[in-house]
């Protein structure tokens, strides 16, 4: 699987999850987040060459065409496959309030 | 130039709802609280509750009873705040007002110019 | 509720005279070094517009006729050298507890 344990343990370039640390405050302004000070978001890049975790018969017969011809543009995309949840907690003035955010985490990628 | 541009006045009836609009421009939608906040006719003003349109996370003022629903259309960076079951009232100008970033709860630095609801049977 | 006492409800000032608003709030706004207050004016069929952020900041773009002071409870903005422009309804407003509650407002005008 495309995932984490794979792929930071490896030096891929094909498909694979990338490490990305975002800080809501230094890189969104979003200062009013209080905890954490930033998560892992992750990303999925890298080219997806035929059989790559291929999402679907149309991606698999796209990745073929592509090694086929190479010239074309046409190629299947490397997008995020598994998503995890991430929970904040920030201030509604003095209140303490505790959100779980859905799709935040990108745990694997697959061509698609 | 940041702007919040809401939609025209509405006439309802008794029990009804009503859905006002919020578009905005010259800032990046996703980033700021947006706030409603209403006036009565020659009256103060009633902070309504709140919206931070990147994750949908809302926060209501209790005294509107669970009759407002704020929403947000990321794609079209417009702010939505429904209120059902209007009565006399509610009639009031309903305000839309921009965060000021620092806090969820804050001061708002940019208002939209209001939409008067009228509520008469 | 936190609720915020404005004094006067109106005032009526000579044009170059300074003119003082005062906002009461029924607990503490100050939290973590910060007192959690800001005030408004709304012109006659206009929206309201901030003047100050956290009781002393001028918000840009406002005149530095007008200042804010105070921390806990009291609060007072000041108007210096009052002008024309000047009239409209003053509110002040508090976020430091859950709901944000404004002042009833103060209406000043000219004489």
């Known amino acids: 699987a495309l995932d984490t344990n794979y792929c930071f343990r490896n030096l891929e370039e094909n498909c694979c999850v990338r490490p990305l640390y975002i800080d809501f405050r230094q890189d969104l302004g979003w200062k009013w987040v209080h905890e954490p000070k930033g998560y892992y978001a992750n990303f999925c890049s890298g080219p997806c060459p035929y059989l790559r975790s291929a999402d679907t018969t149309h991606s698999t017969v796209l990745g073929l065409y592509n090694t086929l011809n190479p010239e074309a543009s046409a190629s299947p995309c490397c997008v995020p496959q598994d998503l995890e949840p991430l929970t904040i907690l920030y201030y509604v003035g003095r209140t303490p309030k505790v959100e779980q955010l859905s799709n935040m985490v990108v745990k694997s990628c697959k061509c698609s | 130039e940041v702007q919040l541009v809401q939609s025209g006045a509405e006439v309802k009836k008794p029990g009804a709802s009503v859905k006002v609009s919020c578009k905005t421009s010259?800032?990046?939608?996703?980033?700021?609280?947006m706030n409603w906040v209403r006036q009565a006719p020659g009256a103060g003003l009633d902070w309504m509750g709140q919206?931070?349109?990147?994750?949908?996370?809302?926060n209501y003022n209790e005294m509107f009873e669970g009759r407002v629903t704020l929403t947000a259309d990321t794609s079209t960076s417009t702010a939505y705040m429904e209120l059902s079951s209007l009565r006399a009232g509610d009639i009031a100008v309903y305000y839309c007002?921009?965060?000021?970033?620092?806090?969820?709860?804050?001061?708002?630095?940019?208002w939209g110019q209001g939409t008067l609801v009228t509520v008469s049977s | 509720d936190i609720v915020m006492t404005q004094t006067p409800p109106s005032l009526s000032v000579s044009p170059r005279e300074t003119a003082s608003i005062s906002c009461r709030a029924s607990?503490?706004?100050?939290?973590?070094?910060?007192?959690?207050m800001h005030w408004y004016l709304q012109k006659p069929g206009q929206s309201p517009q901030l003047l100050i952020y956290l009781a002393s900041n001028l918000e840009s773009g406002v005149s530095d006729r007008f200042s804010g002071s105070g921390s806990g409870t009291d609060f007072t903005l000041r108007i210096s050298r009052v002008e024309a422009n000047d009239t409209g309804v003053y509110y002040c407003?508090?976020?430091?507890?859950?709901?944000?509650?404004f002042g009833q407002g103060t209406k000043l005008e000219l004489k």
């Open positions: 010259g800032y990046t939608f996703i980033t700021y609280w």
């Open positions: 919206i931070f349109p990147a994750w949908g996370m809302t």
């Open positions: 607990e503490s706004v100050d939290s973590y070094g910060n007192s959690f």
């Open positions: 007002a921009r965060g000021y970033g620092n806090y969820a709860l804050d001061a708002m630095d940019y």
């Open positions: 407003q508090q976020n430091n507890e859950d709901p944000l509650t």
